[in-house]
């Protein structure tokens, strides 16, 4: 016996209450594939969620987060509060990064500054709560008479453009 329900198109459901008619999905529901015996309830983007794409009879709604929040998880399943750069979100809210750590985004955690000395380099620019340190040449590279990997550019005479 052929299962007629399997032929009901997306946007409908095979309604057993109504003798297997391929009935359009009721309001606020959808079926993204054919052969469905029920329509799925549309996701509602409420509270900290806002609608990015409306629900249709064949596809679910898609949500974003309202201003001041960002998406987490598959299909934006959660919204997490934004913090400022130089902060991280804790159970008690946004807290400044501890000394020696930084966060250059509105989300995520504070990460330790790069330890330049581990690579045998020196600190060229100090780190802040918002920015990592910038490592420069090793102290040995900066000593007088040290050979440079790239020769210095020739000095130009004033008033002359390069050839």
């Amino acid at each position: 016996l052929q299962d007629l329900c399997s032929n009901c198109p997306a946007g409908t459901f095979c309604d057993n209450n109504r003798s297997q008619i391929c009935s359009p999905c009721p309001p606020n529901s959808f079926s993204s594939a054919g052969g469905q015996r029920t329509c799925d309830i549309c996701r509602q983007c409420k509270g900290v969620f806002k609608t990015r794409k409306e629900c249709s009879s064949t596809s679910n709604a898609e949500c974003d987060c309202i201003s001041g929040y960002h998406c987490l998880g598959a299909e934006c399943s959660m919204c997490e509060q934004d913090c400022k750069q130089g902060q991280e979100l804790t159970k008690k809210g946004c807290k400044d990064c501890c000394f020696g750590t930084f966060n250059d985004q509105k989300r995520g955690i504070c990460r330790p500054w790069t330890n330049c000395s581990l690579d045998g380099k020196s600190v060229l620019v100090n780190g802040t709560k918002e920015r990592d340190v910038v490592c420069g040449p090793s102290p040995a590279d900066l000593s007088p008479g040290a050979s440079s990997a790239t020769p210095p550019a020739p000095a130009r005479e004033p008033g002359h453009s390069p050839q």
Epitope: L4, N7, C8, T12, Q20, C22, S23, P27, T38
Partner: antibody, heavy 118, light 112 residues
């Protein structure tokens, strides 16, 4: 726009058959079920049967079960309703109607008058 | 078969006044999805019927908000908050849940 256009009026003798067509346009024909409803002069509307346009399976009211055939031609986006062994009580306006929302017939044809007279 | 009983059968109304039509079903029209499968149609003189309300209380596309449907068990009501001249015709309730789908006998709304 979405519409259903039915074939013209028919005059039939008792015992004969009539076949009414309903051509759909402006939407995906195979997505929506099609129903047939009739209305005898001065009477209430009477549901006759439906066809799952995309699949072709049908369900009929018991009252017409032995005399009605609903068929469809998907390539022509057309549904047909054939009623046999006509009698005088079958004189009515016959409507096709699309089930466009859950259980609701949102688009109706203009109706086809079928007269049964000897 | 599910019997649909409408009242009144005739309803004279003054334009701008409200109107109410009742429909009672002999059995529950509650679908397993939680909706009552009850429709309201208006058939204007010389025209095909048009869908007003489906699933008991949801206005069909393009239907003015002066039309509303309510439900209580097997009792259903169509309300028109302010009747306009264009609302004249015969109003039918219908159940599309159990075969054979059945209509009420109709309520003829006319302007006083």
């Amino acid at each position: 726009q979405v519409q259903l256009v039915q074939s013209g009026a028919e005059v039939k003798k008792p015992g004969a058959s009539v076949k009414v067509s309903c051509k759909a346009s402006g939407y995906t024909f195979t997505t929506y079920p099609m129903h047939w409803v009739r209305q005898a002069p001065g009477q209430r509307l009477e549901w006759m049967g439906w066809s799952n346009a995309g699949i072709g399976n049908t369900k009929y009211s018991q009252e017409f079960q032995d005399r009605i055939t609903i068929s469809r031609d998907t390539s022509a986006s057309t549904v047909y309703m054939e009623l046999s062994s006509l009698r005088s009580e079958d004189m009515a306006v016959y409507y096709c109607a699309r089930e466009g929302v859950a259980g609701g017939f949102d688009i109706w044809g203009q109706g086809t008058m079928v007269t049964v007279s000897s | 078969d599910i019997v649909m009983t409408q009242s009144p059968l005739s309803l004279p109304v003054t334009p701008g006044e409200p109107a109410s039509i009742s429909c009672r079903s002999s059995q529950s029209l509650l679908h397993s999805n939680g909706y009552n499968y009850l429709n309201w149609y208006l058939q204007k003189p010389g025209q095909s019927p048009q869908l007003l309300i489906y699933l008991g209380s949801i206005r069909a596309s393009g239907v003015p908000d002066r039309f509303s449907g309510s439900e209580s068990g097997t009792d259903f009501t169509l309300k028109i908050s302010r009747v306009e001249a264009e609302d004249v015709g015969v109003y039918y309730c219908m159940q599309p849940l159990q075969i054979p789908y059945t209509f009420g006998q109709g309520t003829k709304l006319e302007i006083k």
